[in-house]
Interface confidence: low
């Protein structure tokens, strides 16, 4: 199983070596987005519908004081970035903790000079990995330094920094609604002409968690090949929920050969193609 | 203190609406999801209703949706609940209730409405 | 919704003796667990959270365990006060959902 992980996402922006005020930050609980943070009012405020119904408003005043924090953090290393041109520049910081089935944790952080890595930490140990480019070397060295003037960077600091984050990853996965129910998925097969004498049939799966789904076309109850098939990728719909979709090419007047067949945590079902309108099939919810 | 206040219960006729008021104190209401439970004569509890701390989400129990609306004044400290179209079976102790998302560790005393005719 | 069925429905004991209550839930619900004790004409008040975790102030004879679809309340040794109506409940999904209560009676 996977593990459950809480991740943020930091970037402070510079324009001709002015470092902007404020920040960018965004959240992610289980790989969904939870979080993100409004520059304009300057708080962290909940992004989905099951981020906003399930948790209370003091994460939020817990998560707005730790992003001003981080974001602050993050906007005094880019200062000691040194190799700073004109233009616009930005500095990333992705933080991540893990919670696996065995109950152990992971903890890291990776740092992203206009989008190119340079740094990665692990908190629970404090090893630093720097890529093999001397970009990214020059780069690391600078904020490592840095680093070591700041009193606060201690080793004591990044396992807080671990702890911390493991403790809301913990206390959110508690929180009321449980984030791992399952909902099954809204199914629809919709058909559009290609050309004279085929047409693609479409059958999207939408709103559905966790996240594993099968979806795939059947002729006469046999599954097609991978390659006359085309899939599209497993997506959050930002509502704590996924979206996906299968499509394939069919000759006219067969439709009622194909069906799209949907697996999704030990239910399953299969969807006929419409003749002449878009057909909508919702399974039972169980939420 | 922490406490809740529950008013507004009364004996109605059914087919008829009633308000009932919840007053909060002594804690940050405006941080807090704030639901409705109820228990009828010598029965078990019933969960009715939840706002959101800022009152952009509500749900209802089945029971109720449609008929019952939930809400709130943060500027008051109050918890509201309009409940029209009352039925017999909707006679209860009606409770406001909150605390953390996971145990409702404050309650009010309770409020009770009988739907008679 | 998710139905919490808890038994018994009632039980006889005595001061001193260990009581256990169980709550089965219609499908998973992780550990979004709570567990209430009411006496008549009285509040309910708040037990445990979580499934498993104290209330402050409660005292330590009160536990709960479980997780998924089977939870237990245990008190380890009766005292006089505990006598009361338990109720189990259900926060996993919305609507949130109690079970019918578990009337403990002096033997």
């Known amino acids: 199983a996977e593990p459950h992980s809480l991740r943020y996402n930091l970037m402070v922006l510079s324009q001709d070596e002015s470092v902007q005020s404020g920040f960018l930050a965004e959240g992610h609980l289980d790989g969904q987005p939870f979080l993100r943070y409004d520059r304009q009012k300057r708080r962290a405020k909940p992004q989905g519908q099951w981020a906003e119904d399930v948790l209370g408003a003091k994460t939020w005043d817990t998560e707005t004081e730790d992003l001003t924090e981080n974001g602050q953090d993050l906007r005094r290393t880019l200062t000691h970035i040194k190799d700073q041109k004109g233009g616009l520049h930005s500095l990333q910081e992705i933080r991540v903790c893990e919670i696996h089935e065995d109950s152990s944790t992971r903890g890291s952080r990776h740092f992203y000079y206009d989008g190119e890595l340079f740094l990665s930490q692990n908190l629970e140990t404090q090893e630093s990995t720097v890529p093999q480019s001397s970009r990214a070397q020059t780069l690391a060295m600078n904020v490592t330094n840095f680093w070591k003037e700041d009193a606060m960077k201690t080793k004591t600091h990044y396992r807080a920094m671990q702890a911390d984050c493991l403790q809301k990853l913990q206390r959110y996965l508690k929180s009321g609604v449980a984030i791992r129910r399952t909902v099954p998925p809204m199914v629809n097969v919709t058909c559009s002409e290609v050309s004279e004498g085929n047409i693609t049939v479409t059958c999207r799966a939408s709103s559905f968690y966790p996240r594993n789904i099968t979806l795939t076309w059947r002729q006469d109850g046999v599954s097609l090949s991978h390659n006359t098939q085309q899939w599209g990728d497993v997506l959050p719909d930002g509502n704590g929920t996924y979206q996906t979709w299968v499509a394939t090419r069919i000759r006219q007047g067969e439709e009622q050969r194909f069906t799209c067949y949907m697996e999704h945590s030990g239910n399953h079902g299969t969807h006929p193609v419409p003749s002449g309108k878009v057909l909508v099939l919702q399974s039972q919810r169980t939420d | 203190q922490v406490q809740l206040v529950e008013s507004g219960g009364d004996v109605v006729q059914p087919g008829r609406s009633l308000r009932l008021s919840c007053a909060a104190s002594g804690f940050t209401f405006s941080n807090y999801n704030i639901h409705w439970v109820r228990q009828a004569p010598g029965k078990g509890l019933e969960w009715v209703a939840v706002i959101r701390y800022d009152g952009i989400n509500k749900y209802y129990a089945d029971s109720v949706k449609g008929r019952f609306i939930i809400s709130r004044d943060n500027s008051k400290n109050t918890l509201y609940l309009q409940m029209n179209s009352l039925r017999a079976e909707d006679t209860a102790v009606y409770y406001c209730?909150?605390?953390?998302?996971?145990?409702?560790?404050?309650w009010g005393q309770g409020t009770m409405v009988t739907v008679s005719s | 919704a998710i139905q919490l069925t808890q038994s018994p429905s009632s039980l006889s004991a005595s001061v001193g003796d260990r009581v256990t209550i169980t709550c089965r839930a219609s499908?998973?619900?992780?550990?979004?667990l709570a567990w209430y004790q009411q006496k008549p004409g009285k509040v309910p008040k708040s037990l445990i959270y979580?499934?498993?975790s104290l209330e402050s102030g409660v005292p330590s004879r009160f536990s709960g365990s479980g997780s998924g679809t089977d939870f237990t309340l245990t008190i380890s040794s009766l005292q006089p006060e505990d006598f009361a109506t338990y109720y189990c409940q259900q926060f996993n999904s919305y609507p949130i959902t109690f079970g019918q209560g578990t009337r403990l009676e002096i033997k």
């Open positions: 499908q998973g619900i992780s550990s979004a």
């Open positions: 979580d499934a498993s």
């Open positions: 209730a909150s605390g953390p998302p996971d145990a409702f560790n404050i």
